[in-house]
Interface confidence: low
């Protein structure tokens, strides 16, 4: 009698190795004998396919040669005409011996940085990667993190990171090593001792010492008022990733010298620049009497801080006078720099407006210090913190020289708006008024070492700090 | 370090619709597939729905079919499910989880990361 | 639809104690099978996956097993922190279906 079709053995998950054979049995009773069509993932599995072999009616599927690839479900169906088709499904599992597909590279990294090293596998059962630094497994800790994917991550890497790297990809069929990768950490061009400022006799000799540090060993050279030093001698030494320069000087005029520190990191440079001013005694005289000329302000540094077009005075005591004061104010903001968002625009146009005075041009042209008031506003308000700290440094010694002196007015010493109006400058980029101050946080002192006026608004006075420099 | 972070839950009324995503991290949402799983109070947890985006391929649990939809935007690496025609029996914390792979092989790695899960009621 | 029968649906052990407990699908399945604790107001987090793999950072006193339409999870010795809920779960070509879960408690 006919019979409809009846799967008796339900195909079975089958793990199978790569390269190994793997056969699925779907046994049928049925009257008359059915026709029996295999799918893999439901796409149907040809008869002729040279990868397979399809045995006893159809109801034994081998795969001759199992590779990672072949992973799915596969299904058969038999049908004879009698009643509906019947389907059985089951699970091929490609169990494979771990793989490293993407093995680490090795890796040139500026310390700071994030690097990756990649370690990506296949397996299955998947594969567990573990890391191997030197002979030793690595640790992981919060820096450092063996990723899901497997590859290793190592956050703001240090000079000790650098060294050999492999990874470890285990599963219960094997294991297998990537080859040893180095990761190599540079480290940015950084100025260990800074060179120091002198007042000398005129005809003295100076030696000037600047000391770097950096991975590849910096490259040390000086610049004297902008220009490459033209006379005097440099001796230099390196020891343990360390150069020392030493410049020998014969004094004749006052002059800006800066030590500038290089190293490359592929196609960039990082530099580091000291500076340090040598002054002639006989030449210090009274700032009334101080030579210069005014110019419009075309240097980089101060460029969002000073009026567009603004004319500045420039000191002819310096060589170039415009190449000084611009690596004056560069050096001064570098010593200032780890500075909150609110003090910072604010220092950065004090800074700028003293080294950079505005001139009043006439048969004398003469530099305008800032007023009084507006510097207090900046010691006191804006930087309240940052200048206690400056000024614990300077009792301590810890700045160079007076290098800092240049840099930072002493607020007390500048003359005060009332005095003169016209006498003093105001910092176009900082107006305040006692409505804005109600944001800022108590001061440092007990009370302010002046009594902080009502200043008339003016369209020079275009700054106040409001929610952009806001507190919070 | 990978994290799934789920949002959107909330209060809505019978028939409402809701938007929940789930914002990745620490891997990428198109090597991966990603699942929503949902638990309603004091209950076991229930498979919702799952996207593989490197297929665009999609699969739902029948409660749900033809009112959710599962979506993900690679380039946020995020995954979405748009809830609409909401039933009272749709009130559950609604997980989004992560399993290697493509809807073919990521049953066989189990669902390694899990969100925290955002809690969806319906009521009137 | 594929059933997961989970069993039992409770059960309260001492520490130190060895615990199973079993899955039976409703019909011949792969061994895409993954065993979750959950703890209360937290996400399940994944113990074993393919029937019998431990998952990284997983004590090794949990195993997983396989036998026809049966799966297994054997905790060989309970920990106190291992008091929670435990459930299956398999996946066909992505139709996921969980177990009702088994709650372990302290006896």
């Known amino acids: 009698l006919p019979k409809a079709p009846v799967i008796t053995t339900p195909l079975e998950t089958v793990d199978a190795l790569v390269e190994e054979v793997a056969t699925f049995m779907c046994a049928v009773e049925s009257y008359p004998q059915p026709e029996i069509s295999w799918t893999r993932n439901k796409i149907l599995i040809k008869l002729f396919d040279t990868r397979y072999s399809i045995r006893e009616n159809g109801q034994l599927l081998t795969i001759l040669s199992v590779e990672d690839s072949d992973d799915g479900i596969y299904c058969c169906t038999a049908n004879n005409g009698v009643g509906g088709a019947v389907e059985s499904c089951g699970a091929l599992q490609v169990k494979m011996k771990p793989k490293i597909t993407r093995p680490p590279i090795n890796v040139k990294i500026i310390e700071g940085l994030k690097a990756v090293l990649p370690c990506t596998t296949m397996g299955n059962p998947k594969p567990s990667v573990s890391w191997i630094k030197g002979d030793s497994p690595l640790r992981e800790n919060s820096r450092i993190a063996v990723l899901e994917s497997g590859s290793l991550r190592i956050h703001n890497v240090q000079k000790e990171d650098a060294g050999q790297y492999r990874c470890v990809a285990k599963n219960s069929l094997g294991t297998a090593y990537s080859k040893v990768v180095k990761l190599e950490v540079e480290v940015f061009a950084r100025i260990l001792r800074a060179p120091e400022s002198h007042n000398v006799t005129f005809g003295s000799f100076v030696t000037l010492h600047c000391t770097a540090t950096g991975i590849p060993v910096p490259t040390i050279t000086w610049i004297e008022n902008g220009n490459a030093v033209s006379s005097g001698s440099i001796q230099e030494s390196v020891k343990d990733r360390v150069i020392d320069s030493r410049l020998q000087l014969f004094i004749t005029k006052p002059g800006l010298y800066t030590c500038i520190a290089t190293n490359k990191h592929g196609e960039k440079f990082s530099t580091a620049k000291a500076a340090a001013t040598i002054s002639i005694a006989e030449w210090s005289k009274p700032q009334k009497d101080n030579k210069g000329y005014c110019a419009q302000y075309r240097g980089e540094v101060c460029n969002a801080v000073l009026a567009k077009d603004a004319l500045v005075f420039l000191n002819t005591s310096y060589a170039d006078p415009e190449e000084a004061q611009e690596l004056l104010v560069h050096t001064a903001w570098n010593e200032l720099k780890v500075v909150s968002p609110v003090c910072r625009p604010a220092a950065e146009a004090l800074l700028c407006n003293h080294i950079f005075q505005e001139c009043s041009p006439g048969v004398v042209p003469t530099p305008i210090p800032i007023c009084r008031e507006y510097c207090l506003a900046v010691k006191e308000l804006f930087c309240a913190k940052e200048w206690l700290v400056m000024e614990e440094k300077t009792h301590r010694g810890l700045y160079r020289s007076e290098m800092h002196l240049l840099s930072v007015p002493e607020c007390s010493k500048l003359p005060s708006m009332h005095w003169d109006p016209t006498a003093c400058a105001r910092l176009p980029h900082l107006d305040y008024n006692k409505e804005n101050l109600k944001t800022f946080p108590p001061m440092t002192s007990s009370k302010p070492s002046v009594d902080i006026p009502n200043l008339p608004s003016s369209s020079s006075s275009s700054f106040s700090v409001s929610p952009t420099y806001s507190m919070t | 370090e990978v994290q799934l972070v789920e949002s959107g839950g909330g209060l809505v009324q019978p028939g409402g619709s809701l938007r929940l995503s789930c914002a990745a991290s620490?891997?990428?949402?198109?090597?991966?597939?990603i699942h929503w799983v949902r638990q309603a109070p004091g209950k076991g947890l229930e498979w919702v729905a799952s996207i593989s985006s490197s297929y665009g391929s999609t699969s739902y649990a029948d409660s749900v079919k033809g009112r959710f939809t599962i979506s993900a935007d690679t380039s946020k690496n995020t995954a979405y499910l748009q809830m609409n025609s909401l039933r009272a029996e749709d009130t559950a914390v609604y997980y989004c989880?992560?399993?290697?792979?493509?809807?073919?092989?990521?049953?066989?790695?189990?669902?390694?990361?899990w969100g925290q899960g955002t809690l969806v009621t319906v009521s009137s | 639809d594929i059933q997961m029968t989970q069993s039992p649906s409770s059960l309260s052990a001492s520490v130190g104690d060895r615990v199973t407990i079993t899955c039976r699908a409703s019909q011949s399945v792969s061994s895409a099978v993954a065993w979750y604790q959950q703890k209360p107001g937290k996400a399940p987090k994944l113990l074993i996956y393919?029937?019998?793999s431990l998952y990284s950072g997983v004590p090794s006193r949990f195993s997983g097993s396989r036998s026809g339409t049966d799966f297994t999870l054997t905790i060989s010795s309970l920990q106190p922190e291992d008091f929670a809920t435990y459930y299956c779960q398999q996946s066909g070509v992505w139709l996921i279906t969980f177990g009702q879960g088994t709650k372990v408690e302290i006896k």
């Open positions: 989880a992560r399993s290697e792979g493509d809807r073919y092989v990521s049953g066989y790695f189990g669902m390694d990361y």
């Open positions: 620490g891997f990428t949402v198109s090597s991966s597939s």
């Open positions: 393919s029937a019998s």
